[in-house]
């Protein structure tokens, strides 16, 4: 909400399934930035009020997050800097199912795209040979 | 620096609906909660709701549930809250403030609510 | 509902001297995770929005005078200020942002003595 005269950037996302009860990974790539500082980094939810997750400035700013997620989600903020904005989601559950969004903006500019993520049940089919 | 601005008083009958206003101007940020709090005549701080304007989540205090309709069109990056079956009790400044903690406040506006 | 009680109602401090605002909540706003506590001070004065001063129940909202402290966890809050000046005075609230509904509590007013 609000202006900027920033140009857009390439985020790129992968859709995904987690296992309930499991970690599970929400792909987000983007162009990186050569200053962690500059990277904001912001992950949302259809239906949900507050953020999922952000992460700015080098670290995690949690006050804006959504009671539904706090304490179950981390980014891999050493591979920040290489343009890796996926987030880590612990303890997967039913209801973490729907649209996502990782929303980047950087000294270059902004960009965001939409993550499907399903969860359920899944294993891994037995090959028999 | 992120300012909201929101719209004029304004005057009602008991029984009718006010739309209320609020846009954004001068941050980057297209993903903060945008809330609406008011408070009646030397009264305290109440939240009414807030709206995701990225995806148009809307979630609403219990209290207001069937009464408040909060909506945001991010094209024009203004929120609107609106109020339905107005009652006197409902004259009130109506803030608008981004984020779950409010760092940016609306100016306010001034529902009164009189046969 | 969480429900946020502040106390006292109102207070009257002289120029120079501490005032000392308490807030108590009906259930620990503490996330013992990362052990931070969602309660935030807001300063109103009349004819004017509210203003964050203080979030995570002690950290300064960058701007605020240093003369404004938080402190408190779990369910009591302290929002002290060291030496009021003249334009302190104002309505102060305190918020919980622990889980929604955001609730307040009813404020406190602060006059001068």
């Known amino acids: 909400f609000g202006i900027s005269g920033r140009h857009s950037i390439t985020v790129t996302t992968v859709a995904s399934a987690g296992n309930i009860g499991e970690d599970g990974i929400l792909s987000c790539t983007f162009e990186p930035d050569i200053k962690l500082s500059d990277i904001v980094i912001q992950w949302l939810k259809e239906g949900v009020l507050g953020l999922v997750h952000e992460f700015k400035e080098g670290k995690d700013e949690l006050s804006e997050q959504d009671e539904m997620f706090r304490g179950r989600t981390a980014v891999f903020a050493d591979q920040v800097i290489v343009g890796n904005a996926s987030l880590r989601l612990k303890n997967v559950q039913l209801t973490d199912a729907g649209t996502y969004k990782c929303y980047i903006i950087t000294s270059k500019g902004k960009g965001n795209a939409n993550l499907e993520y399903k969860t359920g049940a899944f294993s891994m089919p037995e090959v028999n040979v | 620096q992120v300012q909201l601005v929101q719209s004029g008083a304004e005057v009602k009958k008991p029984g009718s609906s006010v739309k209320v206003s609020c846009k954004a101007s001068g941050g980057t940020f297209s993903t903060y909660a945008i809330n609406w709090v008011r408070q009646a005549p030397g009264q305290g701080l109440e939240w009414m709701g807030g709206i995701n304007p990225m995806f148009g989540t809307a979630r609403y205090a219990q209290k207001f549930q069937g009464r408040v309709t909060i909506t945001a069109d991010e094209s024009t990056s203004t929120a609107y809250m609106e109020l339905s079956s107005l009652r006197s009790e409902d004259t009130a400044v109506y803030y608008c403030?981004?984020?779950?903690?409010?760092?940016?406040w609306g100016q306010g506006t001034l529902v009164t609510v009189s046969s | 509902d969480i429900v946020m009680t502040q106390s006292p109602d109102s207070l009257a401090v002289s120029l120079g001297e501490r005032a000392t605002i308490n807030c108590k909540s009906s259930q620990s706003v503490l996330y013992s995770s990362n052990n931070k506590n969602y309660l935030a001070w807001y300063q109103q004065k009349p004819g004017q929005p509210p203003k964050l001063l203080i979030y995570w129940a002690s950290t300064r909202e960058s701007g605020v005078p240093d003369r404004f402290s938080g402190s408190g966890s779990g369910t009591d809050f302290t929002l002290t200020i060291s030496s009021l000046q003249a334009e302190d005075v104002a309505v102060y609230y305190c918020?919980?942002?622990?889980?929604?509904?955001?609730?307040f509590g009813q404020g406190t007013r602060l006059e001068i003595k």
């Open positions: 403030a981004r984020g779950r903690l409010h760092r940016h």
């Open positions: 918020q919980q942002y622990y889980t929604t509904p955001i609730t």
